[in-house]
Every structure is written in structure tokens, then in C-alpha cells.
Amino acid sequence: KNLKSPQKVEVDIIDDNFILRWNRSDESVGNVTFSFDYQKTGMDNWIKLSGCQNITSTKCNFSSLKLNVYEEIKLRIRAEKENTSSWYEVDSFTPFRKAQIGPPEVHLEAEDKAIVIHISPGTKDSVMWALDGLSFTYSLVIWKNSSGVEERIENIYSRHKIYKLSPETTYCLKVKAALLTSWKIGVYSPVHCIKTTVENELPPPENIEVSVQNQNYVLKWDYTYANMTFQVQWLHAFLKRNPGNHLYKWKQIPDCENVKTTQCVFPQNVFQKGIYLLRVQASDGNNTSFWSEEIKFDTEIQAFLLPPVFNIRSLSDSFHIYIGAPKQSGNTPVIQDYPLIYEIIFWENTSNAERKIIEKKTDVTVPNLKPLTVYCVKARAHTMDEKLNKSSVFSDAVCEKTKPGNTSK
């Protein structure tokens, strides 16, 4: 009896794993084996596919074959017993095009109100993604184990921190990778669950801000309790995309180690030009807080985005504010070569109720003021560029009294 060729051959490629599956054509014939050949583009001869010779099952793995993943290949299969079937040719394919991204590896670290997620490709030193390893982005689905209500988070990098969670609560999540450059979406990782810890008696420091004074950076933050020590760490922001890089390591700012105030001053030359992440941790000697939320710190903008300088012309029912370029040390104005938007906060000196105006113009009217009343004003600048979303610190407050009621404009 003539052996029939196997049919319906499927090629599954996940990362560097190449799997072939096929259907037997004749289930009634026993002791049949199957063998594959392959042919590279531009070649006439067929080569035996190692790992897929004389296979008794309907599945084989040819991952050991060192292929150029960008080069088209063709496969053929036949059945063998005493005689052999005719060859069945599989449509040619390019491994890279056919490949799926496998499930990433996930490592979780729990805080009381946050989870740190470390993601790395499932296949280390993958040949398939060798040119795209740094282009992976990830998305995740997270849910509270007790409720199952899912939240999706897209376009995250190899390290991501989810905040505003509840203490002592189990959260579950799964992660998948994507290569947007190649329109590839990967397979989800297994579900990972972790329980957030009991609430830390020491909250993390908050409202971290960087400003420039003379040739120094001044880093300030808020903290709930007194008599604490703080440490500050920094990281190159680009490394967040690639924790596999051996440079990925939070480092101490030497002048900000074990400081006893809620600020520290360090020379500008500590950082070369670039974008950094900063974080702060508090300790009372016995206990340690979790790390603060990280702030992005761009030396280029930070060096120039100083608080605006302004003059106030007082009328009976309004202030006219004229915003000028901030002064550097030496009283030279700073040239801002990117568009700014100004946030002006004002309040009655005897009250805490603040009002806010946001303006692109450098001359601003603050309306609806009461005559003969002291008002205070402070201002800060924001960049309008979304990519460089940065704010200066607020200027010092300037307080002025409005004129009597009948002042003409």
C-alpha cells in the first residue's frame, strides 16, 4: 500500500523555539516515521532537518538548527515505513516574520502600597530578538485577587512600579511583551500574585523637587516626622528600559547620604548632561520607609528652568504682573529657548485660600481684588513640550497692597 504524505504542517516559533506539528494522513498504518528536509532561499539542494528525522510522533523541535532568522526557508515532509510517501512541501516562511514573542519573566517586590515589577525577556540572549532586545515594551493586566476587576497598563518598560495600592492585599498580574516596530504582540506570562505588606509606620518622602542655586542642585522633599535621616539615590532614566544592563543600579548621591534635614545640596557636576531618576528613603534608626515615588530630573532643563522673575503694578482691584527672564548668579538673564507657560498663585495675606492663573503671556492681569488689601503672589514656569514636561520651583512670594478704591486704570 502506498504511504500518503502527511498533511497540515504547522510551524510554531516562540522566541528561539522552533516546533513543527503535522497530521498523519493514514491513522490505520502503524509504525510510521516522519522526516523533514529544509531548503534555504537561492539553494537547489535540500538538507536533512536535524531534530526532525525518523520521528514517531507528530511533533518535532528544530531549535538546534542555527538559521538566519531573516532568511526565507522552505520545508518538506514525508512518511516512511518500508517505503516512503511523496514529499509534502510546506509554504516557505521567514522565521522572524512567523515568530511570536514568548512569555516574559516577571519578578515582583511588594511594598505596603505599591508593587515593583521587574520584567525580562523569557529567552535570555535570544537570537530571534537579538536586534530588537532593547525595543521591547510590555503591557500588563493587574487585579485584586478578591475582586477580579482587571486594570490594563500599556507601554511600560522593564521596570515598572504600580502605586496607590492597599496594604495587606493580594494582587495578581500577567505581563506580555510587544515589539511595536515589528507589529508583534507576545504571549502572556503565567499569573504572578503577591501580597502587599503591612502598612509601614514610616511613609515614604513626598513632593521631591530639584532647584538650582549657584553651582549646586538643591533637592527638597516633605516628610511627616522629625528626627529622621534620609538617603537619596539616582539612576540613569534610559536604564529603566534595560535592567539587564549591568549599569542598572541605583546609586547614592554622596552628599545626600544620611542627611538629617528634608533637603540636600550637591554640586551640579555630580551629574553629566542627561535625564535621571531620583528617589528618597527615610529612616528613624530602627525602621526604614519604602522608597519615595521617583522623580524625573533633566539636567538640561533643570539648569535653565529657574523660577520666573516678575514685577507687580498694583491697582485698586487688580495687579498687573510683568514676567521677565530669571537671573542667574552674576545677575545675567537666562535665555529660555523653548516655550514656557506660567502658573501664578495669589492669595490674600490674611487667608490661606489660594487662587491660580495659568498664562502663556508674560504680562498677566490678576483681577477681582479688594482695595487696600495685601495680596501675595508667587509664580513658576512650566515647559510646554510634552516630552520635557518640567516645572521650575516657585519663586519667592512677593506681597503688595492694592490701591484705594478710586484708582483709575
Epitope: E109, T197, N200, H246, N287
Partner: antibody, heavy 123, light 107 residues
Framework: QVQLVQSGAEVKKPGASVKVSCKAS????????MNWVRQRPGQGLEWIGK????????HFNQKFRDRVTLTVDKSTSTVYMELSSLRSEDTAVYYC????????????????WGQGTLVTVSS | DIQMTQSPSSLSASVGDRVTITCKSS??????LAWYQQKPGNAPKLLIS???TLESGVPSRFSGSGSGKDYTLTISSLQPEDFATYYC?????????FGQGTKLEIK
């Protein structure tokens, strides 16, 4: 697979120094902290310190700070622990143990251990 | 330094028994707790990290629980190969510290 292979047993006189090596294989050596732990005869475990093989940053148990030196040879993926001014109470098995990834935000458990090196201090 | 107090210091049990070992820390350690098993002449072996996460290859009869300052290792049904000394360790604050150990012996 991950392996940590330590140097052989040592006998030293009081006041001398000992240098124990720990050769790592099966993982990216510079991506994980390497810790040292000791165990005195019939006693529990005591953490000595740890080193980052990528840049040699160290952290020590205050108790050992003045007498212990941790070093790295990246070319051979080997970490060394040297203990000076030895006394009889330093007689112990010394273990190297892999800690967490350097990129982690917080410290991690010690997941792989060397086989241990017995250091005997005796006059 | 954070003190780790393990109890009991020794325990006699039979194959098939359910066994519980507890570990108390002098400060809150936020689940940064590991359990190790050590057999005579061998290095410790990590069983559980993060207070509850079973390491790969460790039998499911081992489980960890607890939070804050109080943590527990449970062996649901003792097997002959489980007779050993067990240590807890905190890795929340440096210096990392270990419990004094619990020796699990055959009754």
C-alpha cells in the same frame, strides 16, 4: 545551572589572615550580589557582608567591618573574602551565597550557596 | 540590628506529622523573610522567600505564612528527608540576621 564553588579548607594561626575564594558559573556574574555567611561549629548562621561584582560596592556587618575585605575578579567570575587578625572564635565554615539582582529595589533571599570552606584557627 | 527569634529550638516528630516553626522579628520586616533547610555537612538550601513564595523544586508540603513581625513555616506531612535544621532570615535591613535554628528530629 547556577554553581558556586569555594576553595578548600584552611588551617591558620591566631593573628594571621585567610582568603577564601568563590567561583560562580551558570548565570550573569555581574548582575547579582554575592554574600558571605559563616557558621561556627554547632552554631547558627551569621551574615558577614556582600559585594556587587560589577563595581565592587560592599556592605558589611559592623561586627566584621574592620577585619574583612571583599574583592572580585570579573575575568574569572570569582569573589574573595579575606578575614584578618584571626582568632580562635573565627573557626567556622564560611559560605558564599548569591543574593538578589542588583537591579532590584530591595534586597532578596540567598538562593544559591557554595559548598562551604572550613577555616580552622589554632595555635 | 533586627533580632530573629525562632521557636521551638528543637522538635521531635514522626513521618506524616504536620509541623509548624515560628519566627518573630524585633522590628517589622515587611515580608522580607526567607526559610532555609540545612542538613549536616551541607550548605543551607533556600525553601521560601518573601515569607510565602515557594522556591522552584521545593515540595508543596512546605508553606510559609505571616506578615509584620510574625512568620511561620509549615510542613504539612513530614517525609523522612525533611529531618534537618531550619533557619529563618530577615533581609529587610542590613545586617541580615538569622534565627538561631530549629532542629527537627525523628521521634
Amino acid at each position: 545551572q547556577v554553581q558556586l564553588v569555594q576553595s578548600g579548607a584552611e588551617v591558620k594561626k591566631p593573628g594571621a589572615s585567610v582568603k577564601v575564594s568563590c567561583k560562580a558559573s551558570g548565570y550573569t556574574f555581574t548582575s547579582y550580589w554575592m554574600n558571605w555567611v559563616r557558621q561556627r561549629p554547632g552554631q547558627g548562621l551569621e551574615w558577614i557582608g556582600k559585594i556587587d561584582p560589577s563595581d565592587s560596592e560592599t556592605h558589611f556587618n559592623q561586627k566584621f567591618r574592620d577585619r574583612v575585605t571583599l574583592t572580585v575578579d570579573k575575568s574569572t567570575s570569582t569573589v574573595y573574602m579575606e578575614l584578618s587578625s584571626l582568632r580562635s572564635e573565627d573557626t567556622a565554615v564560611y559560605y558564599c551565597a548569591r543574593g538578589g539582582r542588583i537591579s532590584f529595589d530591595y534586597d532578596a533571599a540567598l538562593d544559591y550557596w557554595g559548598q562551604g570552606t572550613l577555616v580552622t584557627v589554632s595555635s | 540590628d533586627i533580632q530573629m527569634t525562632q521557636s521551638p529550638s528543637s522538635l521531635s516528630a514522626s513521618v506524616g506529622d504536620r509541623v509548624t516553626i515560628t519566627c518573630k522579628s524585633s522590628e517589622v520586616i515587611y515580608n522580607r523573610l526567607a526559610w532555609y533547610q540545612q542538613k549536616p555537612g551541607n550548605a543551607p538550601k533556600l525553601l521560601i522567600s518573601g515569607a510565602t513564595t515557594l522556591e522552584s523544586g521545593v515540595p508543596s508540603r512546605f508553606s510559609g505564612s505571616g506578615s509584620g513581625k510574625d512568620y511561620t513555616l509549615t510542613i504539612s506531612s513530614l517525609q523522612p528527608e525533611d529531618f534537618a535544621t531550619y533557619y529563618c532570615q530577615q533581609y529587610w535591613n542590613k545586617p541580615f540576621t538569622f534565627g538561631q535554628g530549629t532542629k527537627l528530629e525523628i521521634k
